[in-house]
């Protein structure tokens, strides 16, 4: 006899990276017929939802209207059908961004390179942080972590055309509180064949559409959040 129900899915809309004072919704999807959902934050009960009518609802939303450092951290959810509880969901790391300062991102030898060249990104922030994060914009939200007193190096090694795209970096004050994003740096990698078009599976965006990027990233998740690439989430743990 089954003692627990399958774990629900948890995700954040529009994104798990939330600028301070902006809104975010944590979604928890369980099963139709669930009579109660519980959202837990850092191991403590955060909120409860009892859907009405339960047989017509399989997803609930927990709204955070004003993101701040107190709301940043690890969330999970569970649901109940009758007296039977589910396994807990995976952990959702909710990150508050736009804290304190803005780092500077640079690339060596430059933003336009030939396939096979060694490329290194440098993220610099003069305030009190020793952890840095480099993100490549696009659906899979690739994140690299680096360390340094005021600057971190991110060696990409010999690059291929797959490295083409727009990069930003953050200073991290703790796992869940990040700085403002740096200005974007667009890396252009020219292959043997003269073709400088961007890889279609990894779209990039102009400097003023970081918010659009976040929404676009999450759109892929909404289509099938079970298959979403959790690279960025796992890196936080």
């Amino acid at each position: 006899q089954q003692q627990t129900l399958p774990k629900p899915f948890i995700w954040a809309e529009p994104h798990f990276m939330v600028p301070k004072e902006k809104q975010v919704t944590i979604c928890c999807q369980g099963n139709y017929g669930a009579v109660e959902y519980q959202l837990h934050f850092e191991g403590s009960l955060f909120a409860v939802d009892r859907p009405k009518p339960p047989e017509r609802i399989n997803k609930v939303q927990f709204y955070i209207p004003d993101m701040n450092s107190r709301m940043a951290g690890q969330y999970s959810c569970i649901y109940r059908v009758g007296e039977l509880w589910s396994e807990p969901s995976n952990l959702l790391d909710l990150v508050v961004t736009e804290m304190y300062d803005t780092p500077t991102l640079s690339v060596h030898p430059g933003p336009e390179v030939i396939s096979g060249e060694k490329v290194t990104f440098y993220c610099r922030l003069d305030t009190a942080t020793s952890m840095f994060l480099l993100l490549k914009e696009g659906r899979s939200s690739h994140v690299q972590r680096g360390y340094g007193k005021v600057q971190a190096e991110f060696p990409l090694g010999p690059v291929t055309t797959a490295h083409r795209g727009t990069y930003r970096c953050f200073g991290s004050y703790n796992n869940h509180a990040w700085s403002f994003p740096s200005e974007p740096v667009k890396l252009l990698v020219t292959g043997d064949i003269e073709n400088t078009s961007l890889a279609p599976e990894d779209p990039t965006f102009p400097a003023d559409t970081w918010g659009t990027y976040l929404l676009t990233t999450e759109t892929g998740l909404q289509k099938d959040h079970a298959l979403w690439d959790h690279t960025a989430q796992n890196l936080l743990r």
């Epitope: 919704t25 934050f41 403590s44 009960l45 955060f46 909120a47 409860v48 939802d49 009892r50 859907p51 009405k52 609930v60 939303q61 927990f62 709204y63 955070i64 209207p65 004003d66 107190r70 709301m71």
Partner: nanobody
Framework: QVQLVESGGGLVQAGGSLRLSCAAS????????MGWFRQAPGKEREFVAA????????HYADSAKGRFIISRDNAKNTVSLQVNSVNLEDTAVYYC????????????????????WGQGTQVTVSS
């Protein structure tokens, strides 16, 4: 913006009952989950009870189950907490709080999830 003002506190004898009220200003009261918290001398603020924006869903701390009843009147912008069989451990400052929710059936439990707080009303239980 929501302003919250608690009332109904004071001195009460052990074994008696009291009713705390919280008046909210603003036209969006019916969109907020409302909660009661309390803070005893030398202790952290603790959750007591909460009610969803629709009033259909309530949630109580284990220590509050059975003796406490939370209710709301969206027409009057008020939320109340009835406390029965009060005991010395109920001595505390009681706070009303409001949390904006996406769904009418959500109650917020964690203090971090509340956007607005009242100034509190003191309840003192005498033996």
């Amino acid at each position: 913006q929501v302003q919250l003002v608690e009332s109904g506190g004071g001195l009460v004898q052990a074994g008696g009952s009291l009713r705390l009220s919280c008046a909210a200003s603003g036209r969006t009261f019916s969109r907020y989950s409302m909660g009661w918290f309390r803070q005893a001398p030398g202790k952290e603020r603790e959750f007591v009870a909460a009610i969803s924006s629709s009033g259909d869903v309530t949630h109580y701390a284990d220590s509050a189950k059975g003796r406490f009843i939370i209710s709301r009147d969206n027409a009057k912008n008020t939320v109340s907490l009835q406390v029965n069989s009060v005991n010395l451990e109920d001595t505390a400052v009681y706070y009303c709080a409001a949390s904006l929710t996406a769904r009418a059936t959500t109650v917020t439990v964690h203090p971090n999830g509340y956007n607005y707080w009242g100034q509190g009303t003191q309840v003192t239980v005498s033996s």
